[in-house]
């Protein structure tokens, strides 16, 4: 499965759209998880509404929001107020019972805001309304990875 690379600016929002076959995934909830390394387990961040018919409603966990357009076959995840620690490897998943099918692997890179320097001071209100999807460069990642990954915050 190819990995989509998305870039977002620190302090701003990043919108991730994962498309899927609406018929094949009919009735299934979707989830967004963070991999603890390229081959490590995927730690659930947020999932869509427990009632599939209400999947269009936004579900939030901290600064991450998910909503699913089940007719169009698009699940949208918004990472608000990006921080350096948000960089990493994520997955869009389709849930079927205890099983999770990977819809898309997403590598999120967080770029430093060139305007957010010392002169701006510490009190800086992020532009949460904006979204930056960057260049969606597709590439395959097939690197060897260490087998054990420490927990993430």
């Amino acid at each position: 499965l190819n990995t989509t690379v998305l870039q977002g600016m620190a302090g701003q929002s990043l919108r991730v759209s994962c498309t899927y076959d609406a018929l094949k995934h009919w009735g299934r909830r979707k989830a967004w998880c963070r991999q603890l390394g390229e081959e490590g387990p995927c730690q659930r961040v947020v999932s869509t509404h427990g009632v599939w018919l209400l999947a269009f409603l936004k579900k939030r966990n901290g600064s991450t929001v998910i909503a699913d357009d089940t007719l169009a076959g698009t699940v949208t995840i918004t990472l608000k107020n990006l921080q350096a620690g948000d960089a990493g490897l994520y997955q869009c998943q389709s849930l079927r019972g205890r099983e999770a099918e990977v819809l898309q692997k997403v590598l999120v890179e967080v770029l430093e805001d060139p305007l957010d320097d010392q002169d701006a001071g510490d009190l800086w209100v992020p532009e949460e309304s904006s979204s930056f999807e960057g260049a969606q460069v597709e590439h395959s990642t097939s690197r060897n990875q260490e087998t054990s990954f420490p927990p993430t915050s």
Partner: antibody, heavy 122, light 107 residues
Framework: QVQLVQSGAEVKKPGSSVKVSCKAS????????ISWVRQAPGQGLEWMGG????????NYAQKFQGRVTITADESTSTAYMELSSLRSEDTAVYYC???????????????WGQGTLVTVSS | EIVLTQSPATLSLSPGERATLSCRAS??????LAWYQQKPGQAPRLLIY???NRATGIPARFSGSGSGTDFTLTISSLEPEDFAVYYC?????????FGGGTKVEIK
Amino acid sequence: QVQLVQSGAEVKKPGSSVKVSCKASGGTFSSYAISWVRQAPGQGLEWMGGIIPIFGTANYAQKFQGRVTITADESTSTAYMELSSLRSEDTAVYYCARGGGTFWSGSWALYWGQGTLVTVSS
Amino acid sequence: EIVLTQSPATLSLSPGERATLSCRASQSVSSYLAWYQQKPGQAPRLLIYDASNRATGIPARFSGSGSGTDFTLTISSLEPEDFAVYYCQQYVNWPFTFGGGTKVEIK
């Protein structure tokens, strides 16, 4: 076991540049943050900047912006730190350090190089 | 940038005593905080990451606590080899600043 081996000590003239290398072995390289930290004689630790090789984009402390360049070569698992326009106050031990977890959220420095002493003197 | 203030600058204690080191951030760093120990002529050594997780091989007498802006490193009973300089570091956002350090010296 991950090991970071740095290049040897350097003596430089004011105004010149220095490039320090840091070769990683015994573990993967691409998604782990490599940070550069310096320590002037008798002083504390100072974070200069860092890079995640898979991204290739470095981040720098404002103090060093424009004078420091951090790069990484995935093919040789080597990171580099180049500091230009050297002055006497840049005399310090320069360390490279690799995160214990992946990406920036895991950039707590679990593995450290042995340090490279850079002396700037006319 | 986020400023980390460590206190006290110097802590004079005897072996067997309890050491409590403080690190205060100028703004929240969540739990993205690490503690390091450094001895003269050596590279720093990671003790604690993510505010409270002990690194592999670090004795149980070392513990970290706190979140947000206030953090503490506790050494429950000082051993002779624990006398060193201790630094905290945040890695929530760039630049990943260090505190000024706390020197734990023998009384």
